[in-house]
């Protein structure tokens, strides 16, 4: 048994006569043999679920669900209740109605075995019938909505009449009917005004019925029509077995470059026309089990269940359904030497499904784990300026497909054949598994015998110690020119173009800082600034070379304070700035200020 609504509303007036009928509550059957029996909770409740008083005023007919006044609610009774309402004015009280034999504790009132009946209290007597508007004669203030379980026996779930109005204003004639399309499963009995289902409903065919209730009021010669929505929602039960959309029960996957723990290797989708169990229960009752295979597979893979509500078209309307994505996920990082092929089976069980048929599906994943060979191009040829400053980035090395790698830890190293010409360093970038080549020793750059630098680049997979080698040939170009006196260590200090381009700074490949002219559009990522190389700084990312010294690119790497209009970077640096941004790394400060447009003019005049 279950209530067709979770809440009912009616009005209560002072001194309403004992015996006044108030409303009917309705229960629908889950099985044909069930007989409803109603009982009221013992207490009246007020604002914020405050227990006000034992219910001495309202009774229920256990077999029909009719609520009526057992005794008149006078002023003094009302005062008594108001005092207990924590100081709030008492506008609404409610009762709990239970369906026997459901032995719910009084404290809990959850649909389907309990409904709340709210009474709006009016501190006046029942108004004169002639003063009631048609809307008040026809329907309660709060519009009802109904919930009916699918596949259940048909039954009565509503009674249109406002009983107090019918009881106190017998001379006003009120008629009701339902506006509904052809073939809908509802009827309104003309005599009793009871609304019932004609047959069992199927949610998978239609989930919502947006009906309209029409009320016609006859008072003397006057006739008025009132229409209100009459929505019915069909509640789901687990009556559909899971299926494979388009019959696809097998997914094939290749694990190659993406070998990181938590990588989704393959996904299979299961469709279920039902939307139960509800989300809180779903993963517990809709189970997936990776069937025992070899131990390696059990340790290496896991299955993740990702249910999602979807909607499908049925008989011209949309109804909700569930798609379950079963993802085969790597449980650990896979070594690059791992090489095997296997078939994994996953058992999916809709444990609430009662049939006919089975609520069980078998998912198949065909997985090939390919080994990864480390390869470098045979030779790298690069050039570097003799004027390059320490930490200048001059190039990248990268094993084949390194951009696609994840879960593969490759470290790069340079082997130098000559101590006096060992100019370069390499650091491994975590982002793309590449190695960034940078100037580490500027003194070596200036030695005449170091016109060509020969290195071996060695890439090593940290897990297996497998290696790839390539030769690196670096040509040293240009001639060395000593820097002007008084230049700062960091390009970022310079606030104007002229002073910027006169100096070099840490990280500068040419030995000169570069000016980046911003777009002048408020707080922008493209702010004006002085940089060792606009290719790498600022780019919103403090790379692995820039982390080595805060003077290289404080615009990307500073953790200190930024003064002026800006948007801070995540987790550090300046994401966007206003005008020109310059920094003082030693003081851990950057300043973003409006462009100084007089600057070029002044320079011309001073000349």
């Amino acid at each position: 048994l279950y209530f067709s609504r979770d809440a009912y509303w009616e009005k209560l007036y002072v001194d309403q006569a004992a015996g006044t009928p108030l409303l009917y509550v309705h229960a629908l059957r889950d099985a044909p043999e069930e007989v409803p029996s109603f009982r009221l909770g013992q207490h009246l409740y007020g604002t914020y679920r405050t227990r006000l008083h034992e219910n001495n005023w309202i009774c229920i007919q256990e077999d029909t669900g009719l609520l009526y006044l057992n005794r008149s609610l006078d002023h003094s009774s009302w005062e008594k209740l108001s005092v207990r309402n924590r100081g709030f004015p008492l506008l609404t009280v409610y009762l709990k109605v239970f369906l026997s034999p459901t032995s719910l504790r009084e404290g809990e009132c959850q649909w389907p075995g309990c409904a709340r009946v709210y009474f709006s209290f009016f501190n006046t007597s029942f108004p004169a019938c002639s003063s009631l508007k048609p809307r008040e004669l026809c329907f309660p203030e709060t519009r009802p909505s109904f919930r009916i379980r699918e596949n259940r026996p048909p039954g009565t779930f509503h009674q249109f009449r406002l009983l107090p109005v019918q009881f106190l204003c017998p001379n006003i004639s009120v008629a009701y009917r339902l506006l509904e399309g052809e073939g809908l499963p509802f009827r309104c009995a003309p005599d009793s005004l009871e609304v019932s289902t004609r047959w069992a409903l199927d949610r998978e065919q239609r989930e919502k019925y947006e009906l309209v209730a029409v009320c016609t009021v006859h008072a003397g010669a006057r006739e008025e029509v009132v229409m209100v929505p009459f929505p019915v929602t069909v509640y789901d039960e687990d009556d559909s077995a899971p299926t494979f959309p388009a019959g696809v029960d097998t997914a094939s996957a290749v694990v190659e470059f993406k070998r990181k723990e938590d990588t989704v290797v393959a996904t299979l989708r299961v469709f279920d026309a039902d939307v139960v169990p509800a989300s809180g229960e779903l993963v517990r009752r809709y189970t997936s089990t990776l069937l025992p295979g070899d131990t390696w597979a059990q340790q290496t893979f896991r299955v993740e269940h990702w249910p999602n509500e979807t909607s499908v078209q049925a008989n011209g309307s949309f109804v909700r359904a569930t798609v379950h994505d079963y993802r085969l996920v790597l449980n650990r990082n896979l070594s690059i030497s791992e090489n095997r092929t296997m078939q994994l089976a996953v058992l999916v069980n809709d444990s609430d499904f009662q049939g006919p048929g089975a609520g069980v599906l078998l998912l198949h994943f065909n997985v090939s784990v390919l080994p990864v060979s480390l390869h470098l191009p045979s030779t790298y040829s690069l050039s570097v300026s003799r004027r390059a400053r320490r930490f200048a980035q001059i190039g990248k090395v990268c094993v084949e497909n390194c951009q696609a790698f994840s879960g593969i830890n490759v470290q790069y190293k340079l082997h130098s054949s000559g101590a006096n010409c060992s100019t370069l360093g390499v650091v491994t970038s975590a982002e793309d598994t590449s190695g960034i080549l940078f100037v580490n020793d500027t003194k070596a750059l200036r030695r005449p015998k170091c016109a060509e630098l020969h290195y071996m680049v060695v890439a090593t997979d940290q897990q297996t110690s497998r290696q790839a080698q390539a030769q690196l040939l670096v040509t040293v170009e240009g001639s060395y020119v000593a820097e002007e006196a008084g230049c700062p260590l960091s390009c970022a200090v310079s606030k104007r173009r002229l002073e910027c381009e006169e100096c070099g700074g840490l990280g500068s490949p040419t030995g000169r800082c570069e000016w980046r002219q911003g777009d002048g559009k408020g707080i922008t990522r493209n702010f004006s600034t002085c940089s060792p190389s606009t290719k790498t700084c600022p780019d919103g990312h403090c790379d692995v070379v820039e982390t080595q010294d805060i003077n290289i690119c404080p615009q990307d790497c500073l953790r200190g304070s930024i003064v002026g209009g800006h948007e801070p970077g995540e987790p550090r640096g300046i994401k966007a700035g206003y005008g020109t941004c310059n920094c003082f790394p030693e003081e851990e400060k950057c300043f973003c200020e409006p462009e100084d447009i007089q600057d070029p003019l002044c320079d011309e005049l001073c000349r």
Partner: antibody, heavy 118, light 107 residues
Framework: DVQLQESGPGLVKPSQSLSLTCTVT?????????WNWIRQFPGNKLEWMAY???????GYNPSLKSRISVTRDTSKNQFFLQLSSVTTEDTATYYC???????????WGQGTLVTVSA | DVQITQSPSYLAASPGETITINCRAS??????LAWYQEKPGKTNKLLIY???TLQSGIPSRFSGSGSGTDFTLTISSLEPEDFAMYYC?????????FGGGTKLEIK
Amino acid sequence: DVQLQESGPGLVKPSQSLSLTCTVTGFSITSDYAWNWIRQFPGNKLEWMAYITYSGDTGYNPSLKSRISVTRDTSKNQFFLQLSSVTTEDTATYYCARGNYDWVFAYWGQGTLVTVSA
Amino acid sequence: DVQITQSPSYLAASPGETITINCRASKSISKYLAWYQEKPGKTNKLLIYSGSTLQSGIPSRFSGSGSGTDFTLTISSLEPEDFAMYYCQQYIEYPWTFGGGTKLEIK
């Protein structure tokens, strides 16, 4: 002037390990350059085998990678070659050589003949 | 690996003559080729590197030329001590590889 001298057993049994020593005089192996092993097969074909740099970094010919190892003893100014699981195909004259900055072999030892035979 | 084909494998000449030995690489190695001399009872000697740069202490009658894939060692006005085994070696691509050698003998 820098001089290199190879030493080790002239005869090794198949499946055993071949161990050679290169003793360097006139130059410290930790101060500069790469120090190499090269071998010459009976038909005169030369094959570069491995290096160890002044800083201790090692590199190996991929064709030998699984069975070769180069180490050094800085206190004795020596570097060593170990080649495991030898076969008769490893019969050759083994040379140690010093590289230049460009990996070219500027100085060579006299060479030592190693025969692999049962 | 870069294959180095050296020719001829055998050469007979008389003192005072000029001879050439050729090396061809299976792919471009730019200028990164070295030439060595091997004589019995002596240590191998680096003659030329970077295709054409004479190693210090090597007589000027030895010269090298070429780049890319084709290289030549020229010995002008042969001296008696020049009769030996000669090898070329590429050192731009790992692993470094040698030519098969040329035996220069007195005619």
